[in-house]
Amino acid sequence: THLGIRLPLRSGLAGPPLGLRLPRETDEESEEPGRRGSFVEMVDNLRGKSGQGYYVEMTVGSPPQTLNILVDTGSSNFAVGAAPHPFLHRYYQRQLSSTYRDLRKGVYVPYTQGKWEGELGTDLVSIPHGPNVTVRANIAAITESDKFFINGSNWEGILGLAYAEIARPDDSLEPFFDSLVKQTHIPNIFSLQLCGAGFPLNQTEALASVGGSMIIGGIDHSLYTGRLWYTPIRREWYYEVIIVRVEINGQDLKMDCKEYNYDKSIVDSGTTNLRLPKKVFEAAVKSIKAASSTEKFPDGFWLGEQLVCWQAGTTPWNIFPVISLYLMGEVTNQSFRITILPQQYLRPVEDVATSQDDCYKFAVSQSSTGTVMGAVIMEGFYVVFDRARKRIGFAVSACHVHDEFRTAAVEGPFVTADMEDCGYNIPQTDESTLMTGRA
């Protein structure tokens, strides 16, 4: 996955502080794989800025070179800047690493807009605020790029956490997480809590803001409230799931559910927006406009281009509807729904108007490559990537932004028949024709 419409950090009031978490149900505790309870060393290990992605600190090579790496569940390569670039403060210097091994193979990754290319190798990698292990992993040393690195984003590479099937140049290049699980006793599961900020940040604040947590090897119960609901991973390439129903303020969009997953639906931390297939996007925007009709906004706002500003602290959250996505459940004919607030899908933008205003971009957009549940969705929830059991879990994030009237929600079960029919079967084509870019 790569930016363009990929990546952020935000939303209204923070959740309850640690120690004041709401009680949660523990009925599924025995089923959860991996270490349970506290992963104190991994909590708050992500940073980021609105629209520019969440990154974790990693070290590469011997002696260790520290880099900030974008966490991307929508791709499968570990790739780092390895040559000077105007937007990079630092980069991986292979010649300084005694443990670097050259694979004598190049890699080229084009996106809808932009690209990166580099040279493949392996080296020792660790995550300082992660599990206390060091693994030998494949690394793409980026030597040339275009519209990939973001000025001021503070990250120098990308950690693709999806499956080998979408790795470049081909599926024989083992992704980082596969290497981590193979070489250690770490359970095959990770979870993400992307927090956002909820209000526009100036540059100083943005650099200092907490972005969230990547828990490697398990689930941290302090990061969510209520219970976790799981949806099957349909196919292990992207983190593909099936959406069975969509509602705006409780009103069903009433579309053939295949449309919601045309040509796939994925969970992607490397994309900023909630991206919807063209037909679904048009129906959703029509419904959101109708729900918020006491105020009118220009077309450019609904296209995600123009910003709308309100006097600081007076954003009329109440006029904007909630968006609910129903996901296939683990039990036959059973689904559950995740509901996000406008505090998630209106993305704060800093430095455009005056300090007396709060300005936002509409962060739901159109896609030609299926539904992408990007940071706009993920910022509402604690998301568990349970690779061991081929499922993704959602619970209400303890840090999600809400107001006194509404909160993000994960609710179920709901009876939904024929959910298998909601999946779109992509016609078999040569793998090389797959679209890489997620603009």
């Epitope: 105020e295 009118k296 220009p298 450019g300 123009q306 910003l307 709308v308």
Partner: antibody, heavy 120, light 108 residues
């Protein structure tokens, strides 16, 4: 065709409240296609946006004037209004009402403007 | 805050000449920019919207171009009635709020 006409006192005393009316003729102020706005221009100077209103009553104000401005609408009379409190000589200007069209983006139709002088 | 800087402040030209007016934004406003013409004692009139689209009834000699931060209003051949003050306005940040300082096109 649609026309806008500003009206109100041409002279206001310092510290008092400036009140203007914009009357819309030849069309309905309740059209869902438009916002309605106020812009002012001090003598010999540039344009300054004051604020906008939608027929539902939803308002947006210039942050620099927000504490002193109120814009309201009366759909039954096809009029919208400007009130600017605690005026000083710096508020002396030609005040224009205008329609925000082209998808709520651009001031595509303006009144002729009315000069308001703040002086004791 | 987005600031719009117009240049030159004054442009002295003769009828029939080509006029090129510039408007520069302090940060990208995409194509969300308008140009207005104001004659003495009159209200401004919308000439160009969305950077390059002529408003209804505006003669073809007026054209707008640019996107991002740099915009140009061109009057291909000045007519006597074109001598006026021209303002740009951005609407990338909505509601529309920021006008440029203006360029006066005067007879040489």
């Amino acid at each position: 065709q649609l026309q806008l006409q500003e009206s109100g006192p041409g002279l206001v005393k310092p510290s008092e409240t400036l009140s203007l009316t914009c009357t819309v003729s030849g069309g309905s102020i309740s059209s869902s296609s438009y916002y309605w706005g106020w812009i002012r221009q001090p003598p010999g100077k540039g344009l300054e946006w004051i604020g906008n209103i939608y027929y539902s009553g939803s308002t947006y104000y210039n942050p620099s004037l927000r504490s002193r401005v109120t814009i309201s609408v009366d759909t039954s009379k096809n009029q919208f209004f400007l009130k600017l409190s605690s005026v000083t000589a710096a508020d002396t200007a030609v005040y224009y009402c205008a329609r925000l069209g082209h998808g709520y983006n651009y001031f595509d139709l303006w009144g002729r403007g009315t000069l308001v002088t703040v002086s004791s | 805050e987005i600031v719009l800087t117009q240049s030159p402040a004054t442009l002295s030209l003769s009828p029939g000449e080509r006029a090129t007016l510039s408007c520069r934004a302090s940060q990208s406003v995409s194509s969300y920019l308008a140009w207005f013409q104001q004659k003495p004692g009159q209200a401004p009139r919308l000439l160009i919207y969305d950077a390059s689209n002529r408003a209804t009834g505006i003669p073809a000699r007026f054209s707008g171009s640019g996107s991002g931060t740099d915009f140009t209003l061109t009057i291909s051949s000045l007519e006597p009635e074109d001598f006026a003050v021209y303002y740009c306005q951005q609407v990338y940040v909505w509601p529309p709020r920021t006008f440029g300082g203006g360029t006066k096109v005067e007879i040489k």
